[in-house]
Amino acid sequence: APVPPGEDSKDVAAPHRQPLTSSERIDKQIRYILDGISALRKETCNKSNMCESSKEALAENNLNLPKMAEKDGCFQSGFNEETCLVKIITGLLEFEVYLEYLQNRFESSEEQARAVQMSTKVLIQFLQKKAKNLDAITTPDPTTNASLLTKLQAQNQWLQDMTTHLILRSFKEFLQSSLRALRQM
């Protein structure tokens, strides 16, 4: 797995470099997670033909994966920093159960899946420090998450491959939208 942001050899070799600002650290963290997702998507696409055939084979997606909407205030039109930040943190917290599901779904990229999961936890902590209105952030119910995990794992191999593909695609889109929004803050 790649080395997490701030721990690469260049950082060690350049002690004179200005420490990263909070925004730069968040930006770097998201880009690091996106790199990890790319690697996981590569394995998923190589292993099955989900990436090409998923659209026509998918009748219904009840995963309720977090998605940015106009009302969340993260788009350029109607941008609202506080509302958007709450949405990003809430969305990442909701993605955690799906990232847990991804563990053990990869053979050659097992470490990468773990790195994506752990880096997301760190990202949530960074963002929570940035957020003022923490009261507005709802944490997913652990019992509901446990039940969801059981349902996902009950699916057969083919559906689990499809689910993995959908999670990675949605998480990538969510992070890309978050990155664009955070750069406006």
């Epitope: 084979a57 009748a59 997606n61 969801l148 699916q155 057969n156 559906l159």
Partner: nanobody, 125 residues
Framework: QVQLVESGGGLVQAGDSLTLSCAAS????????MGWFRQAPGKEREFVAA????????HYADSVKGRFTISGDNAKNTVFLQMNSLKPEDTAVYYC??????????????????WGQGTQVTVSS
Amino acid sequence: QVQLVESGGGLVQAGDSLTLSCAASGRPFSSFAMGWFRQAPGKEREFVAAITWSRGTTHYADSVKGRFTISGDNAKNTVFLQMNSLKPEDTAVYYCAAADGWKVVSTASPAYDYWGQGTQVTVSS
């Protein structure tokens, strides 16, 4: 172990109607997505319709939309396929299928875990 048993097939005239039934035993239906597939001689098995019990949502192949209706009786653990305005090209063996989980519902046959033996539907012109 889940067992699916289809019934209701037969020989009908073009334009007629027919209702297929699929009775399941071994587990309650609520945890499944249920589907109907068909296979004509020399052709691949194709998706016809699907239903999710928990949400009551239905899906159809374009070729049967507006003519076929999938429904279910939760209490009796039975799923139905009401086929109206039948055409000769609807002739096939019809299979009932069940998929665990229902979080992702698919039109692809590998998504389904359990299959019935099939019931023959023949539509003559």
